[in-house]
Interface confidence: low
């Protein structure tokens, strides 16, 4: 027979030879980190047809690490569903909790004993410090000193001392996020007042008022014989300026050689009209990062060598 088979869990006792006589027997022993459980055989014999009798290393079992319980408010997930050495234990906290300690423990062989690479982590409740105070405004739950995950506060502006009110710029409600940080910056309270928009040779068709505060919206149309240069809709922005700028009504000059076109009350040229959405200074959509289970990047929760969950 040729050299006997090799196995993952057991090794040949003695050195292999290039040739074996029929009837010759070889014995195996469990490798370091594996232990023998009877009754399966760990030897084989060179058969008369020059092949080794069937043998397997099923009798040699991997050393296993001690059982780990789920952390309070979390889970201990054995990668590949096993506690055997060479594998890992992954720790995941429930929503609203974060991990203190190692996210992955490794089942390692120390001598012939399998032990975990460290102490199991714990899952702590996500807490936020009070949100920022703002000038000329206040938020709900101002007396609370510690906020829990997803706790929300809502800001409002104080009554203004003068004739013009404070406007709330930004989102009024913020919440305690999963990484102990408030979901967005606090809003601000300030007086926002835009000048009365005057359009010569045109008129206001909506948004009438004597005073124009934050987010006030006004629409215009030009008189007959005039066309709109700019946007027909403007909004009072947080800098007390109109966005887009107040439009102009310009006179329609009839072409010299052709008959002038029939005019409606307002003629808008698409090349000069800017919609509020496309305005360069218009409001930007805010990006809220996706909720994850751990600040920044975790170590690979799924784990190295983790083919099966």
């Amino acid at each position: 027979c040729e050299e006997p088979p090799t196995f993952e869990a057991m090794e040949l006792i003695g050195k292999p030879k290039p040739y074996y006589e029929i009837g010759e027997r070889v014995d195996y022993k469990c490798k370091k980190g594996y232990f023998y459980i009877p009754p399966l055989a760990t030897h084989t014999i060179c058969d008369r047809n020059h092949t080794w009798l069937p043998v397997s290393d099923d009798a040699c079992y991997r050393e296993t690490c001690p059982y780990i319980r789920d952390p309070l408010n979390g889970q201990a997930v054995p990668a590949n569903g096993t506690y055997e050495f060479g594998y890992q234990m992954h720790f995941i906290c429930n929503e609203g909790y974060y991990l203190i300690g190692e996210e992955i423990l490794y089942c390692e062989l120390k001598g012939s004993v399998a032990i975990w690479s460290g102490k199991p982590p714990i899952c702590e409740k996500v807490l936020c410090t009070p949100p920022p105070k703002i000038k000329n405004g206040k938020h709900t739950f101002s007396e609370v000193e510690v906020f829990e995950y997803l706790d929300a506060v809502t800001y409002s502006c104080d009554p203004a001392p003068g004739p013009d009110p404070f406007s709330l710029i930004g989102e009024s409600t913020i919440y305690c996020g999963d990484n102990s940080v408030w979901s967005r910056a606090a809003p601000e309270c300030k007086v926002v007042k835009c000048r009365f928009p005057v359009v010569e040779n045109g008129k206001q068709i909506s948004g009438f008022g004597k005073k124009f505060y934050y987010k006030a919206t006004v629409m215009f149309e030009c008189d007959k014989g005039f066309y709109l240069d700019g946007s027909d809709t403007i909004v009072c922005d947080s800098n007390s300026t109109w966005d887009p700028p107040v439009p102009k009504c310009l006179k329609v000059l009839p072409p010299s050689s052709t008959k002038p076109p029939a005019l409606s009350h307002s003629v808008s040229t698409s090349s000069t009209t800017k919609s509020p959405a496309s305005s360069a200074s218009g409001p930007r959509p805010t990006y809220k990062p996706p909720v994850s289970n751990y600040p920044g990047y975790p170590k690979p929760e799924e784990g190295i060598l983790d083919s099966l969950d």
Epitope: N293, Y297, P300, E301, E302, I304, L305, D306, S307, D309
Partner: antibody, heavy 116, light 107 residues
């Protein structure tokens, strides 16, 4: 044998969206975590995204976070990459890869070109 | 993020040569390292995982060694089909990162 068949690449304008698919066969798809990796023309490999076998955990590279979404349908043995707000720098060959003994099986790759 | 630095980035060799490529991690990654081979227009192919374990079906002329921050891929006798680009990759923590690659071409 293990096979990962990719589709969905093409030419797209900046700011637009595209969805890549990776159809798996020859193994129990629902037991394996999966990844997307990309390679810009003439450049090295860059890991893009990861999804756990049951879809419960996903991780992304900083360069795609908030724009790309990895997902899977275990009943259809298919992995997806939804790419929104595409940029010129997203131009690359995209590969899906199985997380077995590390990245032991790869798709054939699909080219995504972002150009106006 | 863990940076993976591969050297050299370019290597000229002849058939039968012994070739060594090194990969250095910016922080310890134990043995969580893989080596891949990529040929033009093809997907990468896994050669070595867990720093030194040969993937099934890969010729024994390929071997890997190292642990912690220093790793080596060795081709004991370069064959014509081995001319390709080689990448190392760490799987110790997210984001997963690859080395910049080593192109092995014919001298």
């Amino acid at each position: 044998q293990v096979q990962l068949q990719q589709s969905g690449g093409g030419v797209v304008q900046p700011g637009r969206s595209l969805r890549l698919s990776c159809a798996a066969s020859g193994f129990t798809f629902s037991s394996y975590a999966m990844h997307w990796v990309r390679q810009a023309p003439g450049k090295g490999l860059e890991w893009v995204a990861f999804i756990r076998s049951d879809g419960s955990k996903k991780y992304y590279a900083d360069s795609v976070k908030g724009r790309f979404t990895i997902s899977r349908d275990n009943s259809k043995n298919t992995l997806y990459l939804q790419m929104n707000s595409l940029r010129a720098e997203d131009t690359a060959v995209y590969y899906c890869a199985r997380h077995g003994n590390y990245f032991d099986s790869w798709g054939q790759g699909t080219l995504v070109t972002v150009s106006s | 993020d863990i940076q993976m630095t591969q050297s050299p980035s370019f290597l000229s060799a002849s058939v039968g040569d012994r070739v060594t490529i090194t990969c250095r991690a910016s922080q310890g990654i134990s043995s969580y390292l893989a080596w891949y081979q990529q040929k033009p227009g093809k997907a990468p192919k896994l050669l070595i995982y867990a720093a030194s374990t040969l993937q099934s079906g890969v010729p024994s002329s390929f071997s890997g060694s190292g642990s912690g921050t220093e790793f080596t891929l060795t081709i004991s006798s370069l064959q014509p089909e081995d001319f390709a680009t080689y990448y190392c990759q760490q799987l110790a923590s997210y984001p997963l990162t690859f080395g910049g690659g080593t192109k092995v071409d014919i001298k």
